[in-house]
Interface confidence: low
């Protein structure tokens, strides 16, 4: 059957798109790469806005392969520096804490779901 | 081919500012980092900070920080360097470089340089 | 910052000869998520601006000739030119851009008896 626009903005596709394109630094071309900084920056400013973190929350950084992890592994990074709770300077107010995973010091929410609630009123 | 064009050239009065040029060819101008560069005799090179023109972040060697501005106008391509309060250390060449593949940090490409002399 | 710490400050050599100038590090400029070190070495010929001759330590620019090899990881850094030409005569530079801001040796001038 056709798709719909409505299959298109589904948490997969946002997904997929994450994994594959943030912070992804080894692309095969420059038009690939100037994609990868687009999505990249888009999910920093999404999840520094909606304070946010991945497309279901900072379980995405841990359960798939990406090339997030590719480029930062586990132990320095779990999630990006934007799941951290930030100072008015948009600092992590304790970027220790917020890789320890230390409630309160980053967010748990998918970004997703903040996305997807106002679209899906229309 | 990847250009970046500088004047060869800038004579200017201490205490007063100045704007560097470099006009970007060749290549999707929003596409890559522009970084800019000092060089002086003795010092050697002095990487003065970087703007993304796609959206004008910067950063600034905190050295710097109060001396230049970086900027962009996209729609003729061209980077901007503004450095300000000239004093005579700050007679140098200045170079525009642009990034490598994409967020590739090594400078890629280089301007000529251009020469700013402060002298009264 | 990171300081670049380059050796010897100049060298003179013989055309045929081997070259081997060092670049040392404050800090390691190892991505230990890519496993990249994030250090380039740059050329500067007379009267030009720098060109760049090897990224991520070891990887050469398109162009640059295979007598240029660089080689070294974490905070040691090696530059050698295997077979030097004349057309070497040059400052080389090494940098650091694994963090802002990103900072330069102070460069190694080579000259050619």
């Known amino acids: 059957t056709a798709a719909t626009q409505q299959d298109f903005f589904t948490p997969n596709l946002f997904l997929k798109q994450m994994l594959e394109r943030y912070q992804n630094n080894s692309p095969p071309n420059n038009d690939d790469q100037w994609k990868n900084n687009g999505v990249t920056k888009t999910w920093d400013r999404l999840m520094l806005q909606d304070n946010c973190c991945g497309v279901n929350g900072p379980s995405d950084w841990q359960k798939y392969t990406s090339a997030f992890r590719t480029e930062n592994n586990d132990a320095d990074y779990p999630w990006p520096r934007q799941c951290c709770v930030m100072n008015n300077l948009k600092e992590p107010l304790n970027l220790e804490a917020c890789k320890l995973g230390v409630p309160g010091f980053y967010h748990n929410q998918g970004c997703y779901e903040l996305i997807s609630g106002p679209m899906n009123r229309h | 081919q990847v250009q970046l064009q500088q004047p060869g050239a800038e004579l200017v009065r201490p205490g007063s500012s100045v704007k560097v040029s470099c006009k970007a060819s060749?290549?999707?101008?929003?596409?890559?980092?522009m970084h800019w560069v000092k060089q002086r005799p003795i010092q050697g090179l002095e990487w003065i900070g970087n703007i993304d023109p796609s959206d004008s972040e910067t950063h600034y060697n905190q050295k710097f920080k109060d001396k230049a501005t970086l900027t962009v106008d996209k729609s003729s391509s061209t980077a901007y360097m503004q450095l300000s309060s000239l004093t005579s250390e700050d007679s140098a060449v200045y170079y525009c470089?642009?990034?490598?593949?994409?967020?590739?940090?090594?400078?890629?490409?280089w301007g000529q340089g251009t020469l700013v002399t402060v002298s009264a | 910052d990171i300081v670049m710490t380059q050796s010897p400050s100049s060298l003179t050599v013989t055309a045929g000869e081997k070259v081997t100038m060092t670049c040392k590090s404050s800090q390691s400029l190892l991505n230990s998520g890519n496993q990249k070190n994030y250090l380039t070495w740059y050329q500067q010929k007379p009267g030009q601006p720098p060109n760049p001759l090897i990224y991520w330590a070891s990887t050469r620019e398109s162009g640059v000739p295979d007598r240029f090899t660089g080689s070294g990881s974490g905070t040691d850094f090696t530059l050698t030119i295997s077979s030097v030409q004349a057309e070497d005569l040059a400052v080389y530079y090494c940098?650091?851009?694994?963090?802002?801001?990103?900072?330069f040796g102070s460069g190694t001038k080579l000259e050619i008896k």
């Open positions: 940098q650091n851009d694994y963090s802002y801001p990103f900072t």
């Open positions: 060749g290549y999707t101008f929003s596409s890559y980092w």
């Open positions: 470089a642009r990034s490598g593949a994409g967020t590739g940090p090594w400078l890629a490409y």
